[in-house]
Structure formats: C-alpha cells, structure tokens
C-alpha cells in the first residue's frame, strides 16, 4: 500500500514533478539574493530540516514492502519546505531577485504534496521551526541554506519516484 486509502500514487506523475522540482531548486539557488558566503556560519538554523534517512523505507526493498512509510516522509518534507517558501524568510526584505523561480518552486512543492495526499487524507506534518531572522543578511543566509537542503531532499525524492515509476507502477 502506498498512500492512505490503499491506492498507489501516480508514480509517473510524481516522477515528472519531482524532476521539475530538482531543476527549479537547482536554478533557484543563486537567485535568492546577493550574499557573501563568508557569512555562512552556524548550522543550527537548518538542523531541523527534514532529511530522508536509512530507516525511512525509501530503499528499493522498503518501497517494495510498503511504500507508505517513505511517501509519508517525503510528504512531510514537501509540506515543510512549502511552508518555509511562503514564510517571511522568502517574502521579507531583501527582495528576491526578479529571475527567481521561487513561485514555481512553491507551486511544485504544493502540487507534489497534493499528488501524494489526496484531499480527505491526512498524514501528520512535521512542526516548522520558528525561524524569524531579524536582519536582512540573516534572511539571505537562511534562504541559501534552505535551498541547499531542499536540493538534496528533492534529489532523493526524485530517485524514489524514478524507481517507483520503473518498478512499482501498475
């Protein structure tokens, strides 16, 4: 079983959308605002971001046995990042650069999370840490770190969906 209610996700659609997310996350990275990377310091601000780990059932065997565990983990991460992208970290000053695809990224995170959890089904979502940077440079730094961890997250999710589309599609 894959998603609540016992149905499988649309693996191919998920694969396409996760591939698009990879492209968007990669292209967004240099476009969150001008920043001096020497400022990059403490890691604590992004310690709480979701990671897909060994025990999450996202390996080929885990996906075959019961993909729900892995899909729930991916879903939690998508919601987590979607909330961050809609938060003051990205909407506050300094403004995003005009080329930034953050709106596309936000929409795609939402789109993929909806594919994984059709209306009426509810998985518990991870608490969003209260990151409210007061200084513009702190916001830039956080954007940079969030997008870097998002890149890693969607790269793993894309591999999961590629595997699912190839081996688990009905």
């Amino acid at each position: 079983r894959a998603v609540p209610g016992g149905s499988s996700p649309a693996w191919t659609q998920c694969q396409q959308l996760s591939q698009k997310l990879c492209t968007l996350a990669w292209s967004a990275h240099p476009l969150v605002g001008h920043m001096d990377l020497r400022e990059e310091g403490d890691e604590e601000t992004t310690n709480d971001v979701p990671h897909i780990q060994c025990g999450d059932g996202c390996d080929p065997q885990g996906l075959r046995d019961n993909s729900q565990f892995c899909l729930q983990r991916i879903h939690q991460g998508l919601i987590f990042y979607e909330k961050l992208l809609g938060s003051d970290i990205f909407t506050g000053e300094p403004s995003l650069l005009p080329d930034s695809p953050v709106g596309q990224l936000h929409a795609s995170l939402l789109g993929l999370s909806q594919l994984l959890q059709p209306e009426g089904h509810h998985w518990e979502t991870q608490q969003i840490p209260s990151l409210s940077p007061s200084q513009p440079w702190q916001r830039l730094l956080l954007r940079f770190k969030i997008l870097r961890s998002l890149q890693a997250f969607v790269a793993v999710a894309a591999r999961v969906f590629a595997h699912g589309a190839a081996t688990l599609s009905p």
Partner: antibody, heavy 116, light 107 residues
Framework: QVQLQQSGLELVKPGSSLKISCKAS????????IHWLKQRPGQGLEWIGW????????EYNEKFKGKATLTADTSSSTADMHLSSLTSEDSAVYFC?????????WGQGTLVTVSA | DIQMTQSPVSLSASVGETVTITCRAS??????LAWYQQKQGKSPQLLVY???TLAEGVPSRFSGSGSGTQFSLKINSLQPEDFGSYYC?????????FGAGTKLDLK
C-alpha cells in the same frame, strides 16, 4: 548586460514549419530559464513553454503541445522554437524571455505571418 | 489553469492624474504576481514582481499591492511615457497566464 536577440520576421506558407532563434548574451546561459510567448495582433500574451538550458528540461503549455518544440544549444547560447503545421492562427509576434516565472528580460520579438 | 481577470479593459486619463488597474486570479497565487507595461510594437517590460517589488529602473510613481487573488497596480502622477498597455501575470506554477490587458490612453 543581458540581451536576447531574436531572428527576423518570417513570411511562411500554410502547412510549413519554422524555426525561431533567440541568442542570449551577457549572462550564464545554462543558469536561467528561457520562456517563449505568443502575441496575436492587438491581443494579450500566451505562454508557450520554457526550457532550462542547464539540463534541457522543457515544459509546455498543453495548448501548444504538438505545435511548438523548444531546444537549446549551450555551445552557441541559443534557444530555438520550432513551430510545425502552420496555419493563419499561428500568425503572431513570438517573444523569448528570461526568468524564473516573472520575466525581466525579453527579446525584441519575431513577427510570423502565415499566408498563401 | 489559473485565469487572470484584469479591469478596466481601457482607461483614459490625463498627465498628472493617478490611476489604478486591478487584477483578479481565479485561485490563490500568494504574492506571485507581476505587472508589465507594453508600448505599441515593443516587448513587454517588467514593472513589478512578487506583487509589490519594483523592478530595477522603474520609477517610484508605480506601486503594486495585494496578495492571494486580488491585486492592483497604481500609477501616481501619470507621465506622458506611461501611456500604453498593462498586463498582470501570475508566476505561481505553470502555465503562466496573463490578464487580457488594460489600454491606458491620453484623455
């Protein structure tokens, strides 16, 4: 500075095909999306699709699937749009533009007239 | 697809006047909305993005506001170079869609 230079006006026959080019300069071509848009005389703007030259990912507006094909040549920093089976409905100005969703940089437009 | 409804379709005003153009999205687009100006025979030019951020080089008499589904573009103290067509466009997902435009001409 960022520039997008499009190929010149085209007069083509119904049923034929056409390639419009958009040469980018002044920035890293592989790092930004190139969008294509259509504007018929006196009308609004329609989004055709985008290409990301960094990995050649493309996405099309459903309405233009089968009509437009987007490609990019990273060696010449040029994005192309191929239009097939042209009819009078395809007569329009076609623009390329750079952006992630909003479009801060535009080509000058290519006027395409389809006429027997 | 998200539909963008712009009003008014046309607008006549004099130099020095203040005008407001509105745009409604058929669903929530957060603050992912852009405004463009287009002169006859030219390419559109980005004025405002993310609903309220002025693009580089755009005079401060232009201002954008709104979020969710309701947006507006205000032009204070119209200048001769402001006459032309204005379009709104959402940039929340694809396909990108535009309003039908507002033609602003000299009264």
């Amino acid at each position: 500075q960022v520039q997008l230079q499009q190929s010149g006006l085209e007069l083509v026959k119904p049923g034929s095909s056409l390639k419009i080019s958009c040469k980018a300069s002044g920035y890293s071509f592989t790092s930004f999306f190139i969008h294509w848009l259509k504007q018929r005389p006196g009308q609004g703007l329609e989004w055709i699709g985008w290409i990301f030259p960094g990995n050649h990912d493309v996405e099309y507006n459903e309405k233009f699937k089968g009509k437009a094909t987007l490609t990019a040549d990273t060696s010449s920093s040029t994005a192309d749009m191929h239009l097939s089976s042209l009819t009078s409905e395809d007569s329009a100005v076609y623009f390329c533009a750079r952006g992630g969703g909003n479009l801060p940089y535009w080509g000058q437009g290519t006027l395409v007239t389809v006429s027997a | 697809d998200i539909q963008m409804t712009q009003s008014p379709v046309s607008l006549s005003a004099s130099v020095g006047e203040t005008v407001t153009i509105t745009c409604r999205a058929s669903e929530n687009v957060y603050s992912y909305l852009a405004w463009y100006q287009q002169k006859q025979g030219k390419s559109p030019q980005l004025l405002v993005y993310n609903a309220k951020t002025l693009a580089e080089g755009v005079p401060s008499r232009f201002s954008g506001s709104g979020s969710g589904t309701q947006f507006s573009l205000k032009i204070n103290s119209l200048q001769p170079e402001d006459f032309g067509s204005y379009y709104c466009q959402h940039h929340f997902g694809t396909p990108l869609t535009f309003g039908a435009g507002t033609k602003l001409d000299l009264k």
